[in-house]
Structure formats: C-alpha cells, structure tokens
C-alpha cells in the first residue's frame, strides 16, 4: 500500500512536468531506493539545479521568457565551482545571457530570481561592466582571461543559458 | 540644444556607393547608440543600422546587410553611413537619430533633418 | 522579427474630439511592468518627434492632450482634444529586441 501511494504521487508529480518536458533522467539520491532526483532530458545537472543551453539566438527578456516556459529561469552563478560546471557545456566562440541586469542604468545589478547581488562573487572581465546602456550580462571567453561576464545592449540577440531546480520524486 | 544634420545624398546609378554623414552637437556624442532610419517617399519608418556608444556593436536588417556599413568618429562627432550596391529600393530620406535607453530597450530621441538618396538609371 | 499593426491606416476628427490610434505588436512587447513601446509624431517635410516612451511617457514639451497606455500586445495612442495642428503620421516602435520595428503608420486629418 505504501509503495502504491508513493508510485501514485511520483506519477502525478510527473505528469505536471510531462507538458514542458516529455522525458526527465533521474538518479537515485543517497542510499533510499525511494528518493529520485531528476532533470528534463537533455538538461545537465550539478549540485541540485538543472541548466539548459539553448542556442537560439534571441533578446535577453526573450530568453528570460523562453526559461520560464519551460519552469526555470536564466541562469543564476553563485559559486565558482557553478561556473566552472556550467562553462564545460559552452562553445569559445559564442555569448550566453546570464539572468543578472541592470535595467534601470544604475549599476544596480539583480538577478532574476533575487538572490542578492554580492560583489564578492562575480566573475567580470577585466574592465567591466562598462557602459551604463548595456544593462544585461553574458558569459564570454577572452583569450588572455577565460570565461568572464560582459555587459551588453539586452535587445541584442544572444544564446543563453536556463537553470530550474532539481525535480524530486 | 540637441541638433542632428544629415548630408551626402543625393542621386546615383543603381550599383553605385554613396557615404551619409551626421554631424552631431549640443550633447556628449560618445555616450549615446546611434542609429539611421529610412522613409521611402510616401512609405512609413524602417529602420537601417544601429552603432552601439562604444562602437562594440553593430546591426543591421536583411535588406542592407552586405551593403551598407555604420561607423563613427567620436572625436569628430560624427556617425556615418556607407552604402553600397544602391538599389531603386534603397531610395528613401535617410533620417540620423539618437538612442536614449530606457530599460531594456530604446527609443529614438532626437531625429536629424534628413537626407535625400536617390537610386535610378 | 516583430510586427506593429497600426489602425485605422487614416481618420479624419474634428477638433475639440478625440483621436484614438491603436498598435498591435505580434508578440508581447512587455517585461516586468515596463511596456517598451513608443510614439511618434511626423508632420509633412519634417522628421519625426518623439511623443510617448515606454508606452505611457510624455516626452517633455509635449502637450498632456497627448497620452499612451496599454501592455503585451495592445497599445493605444490618445489625441484629447485634438487641435488643427496635430494633422500629422503618427508611428508606433517596439525596442524589446532587435531589429527595432515601426507600425505602418496613421494619417490623422482635421475636418
């Protein structure tokens, strides 16, 4: 009976999902058979997020909405180990809208989940961000500095990157 | 006072080149996108070109891609316009004006005169 | 890229009446509360004028006879109560993303 209700609830769990994602991969959390961690195919996963590159190029807001169809929004980096994951999945030549702007021109940064912006870890180039108009961020690759974030123009279409939360079933 | 003026038109064999100019004054030049925007004689607005402040970015439509090239000189306070392979459907006022950003987009502030091109044989 | 539908394409108002200009934007041109829609004013032989910005903005130095309002899709340009010299095109323009795109234009008349 137990069992019954538990198969019962994941089911129901995974069809509110099935709309926007028709097949999830799930692995086992820790040593409960009972306890499954899953994200859409083909999203990668680290620590307890799922992220999606979509190389659709398009606007920033776009791609915030483009996220949030699927459950998610763009990406939101809180630690370097995050970056270091999410670059392995990136293309050198390429830019990919972070879910961090300045929309008002103040250097106000926010995230669009609200986490607090903490200047303590960002990973800007060197030299930005440095134009009061370009109020959203991407992640680059620059030579002489690796992976780093640059500030540009929000309508300039872009590739992008989406982060949701862990589904648990 | 802001003032935008356009020069450079004029009339040219279909395949033939042109350069616009915009001489800008009465604001910080160099702080501010800028863009050209057309009117065939009798048409409504489409857009031809933007140059971001820095001069980091350009864009164009389908339409002038290949053709047509935006630039500017800072320290002249001017913006250009290079056009080549003229078409008949090239003829238009060609408009210069300023962007002032507004959150995660735009508007045209302040519009040139305008500068008449003329593509015909 | 997104496409402004502007209507009517030309109306003729006496003055002291009001002018209702409508835009229909083929996908949401709104993010968050900020509606990224704007109006211009073109009168014959001159350049367009900035009027409203981000949908319901009145550019200074223009008259508060002139008023913008909606969201998504649907915005609409006011003229109340229009005045002899307001004979003009009228354009509205998306800036949400590139490229940056016009409606076709209303051609307002004074009876």
């Known amino acids: 009976n137990f069992m019954y209700s538990k198969t019962v609830k994941r089911l129901s769990k995974l069809r509110e999902y099935q709309q926007y994602h028709p097949s999830l991969t799930c692995v086992m959390e820790g040593k409960d058979i009972e306890d499954w961690s899953c994200c859409p195919t083909p999203w990668t996963s680290f620590q307890s997020s799922c992220y999606f590159i979509s190389t659709g190029m398009q606007s920033w807001t776009k791609s915030q909405k483009n996220c949030s169809v699927m459950g998610a929004d763009l990406v939101v980096i809180n630690t370097r180990e995050e970056q270091d994951f999410i670059i392995q999945n990136l293309k050198r030549n390429s830019s990919y809208f972070l879910g961090l702007s300045d929309p008002g021109g103040r250097r106000h940064w926010q995230w669009v989940d609200q986490t607090p912006y903490n200047e303590n870890v960002t990973f800007w180039h060197s030299g930005e961000p440095n134009n009061l108009d370009e109020r959203c961020a991407i992640i680059n690759f620059r030579s002489s500095e690796e992976w780093g974030w640059n500030d540009i123009h929000c309508h300039v279409p872009q590739k992008s990157i989406c982060k949701m939360k862990k589904i648990y079933i | 006072e802001v003032q935008l003026v356009e020069s450079g038109g004029g009339l040219v064999k279909p395949g033939g080149s042109l350069r616009l100019s915009c001489a800008a004054s009465?604001?910080?030049?160099?702080?501010?996108?800028m863009s050209w925007v057309r009117q065939a004689p009798g048409k409504g607005l489409e857009w031809v070109s933007t140059i971001s402040s820095g001069d980091s970015y350009t864009y164009y439509p389908d339409s002038v891609k290949g053709r047509f090239t935006i630039s500017r000189d800072n320290a002249k306070n001017s913006l250009y316009l290079q056009m080549n392979s003229l078409r008949a459907e090239d003829t238009a006022v060609y408009y210069c004006a300023r962007q002032l950003y507004y959150s995660y987009g735009y508007y045209f502030d302040y519009w040139g005169q305008g500068t008449t091109v003329t593509v015909s044989s | 890229d997104i496409v402004l539908t502007q209507s009517p394409a030309s109306l003729a108002v006496s003055p002291g009446q009001r002018a209702t200009i409508t835009c229909r934007a083929s996908e949401s041109v709104s993010f968050h509360g900020t509606h990224l829609m704007h109006w211009y004013q073109q009168k014959p032989g001159q350049p367009p004028k900035l009027l409203i910005y981000a949908a319901s903005n009145l550019e200074s130095g223009v008259p508060a006879r002139f008023s913008g309002s909606g969201s998504g899709t649907d915005f609409t340009l006011t003229i109340n109560p229009v005045e002899a010299n307001d004979a003009a095109n009228y354009y509205c323009q998306q800036s949400i993303e590139d490229p940056p795109t016009f409606g076709g234009g209303t051609k307002v008349e004074i009876k």
């Open positions: 009465g604001f910080t030049f160099s702080s501010y996108g």
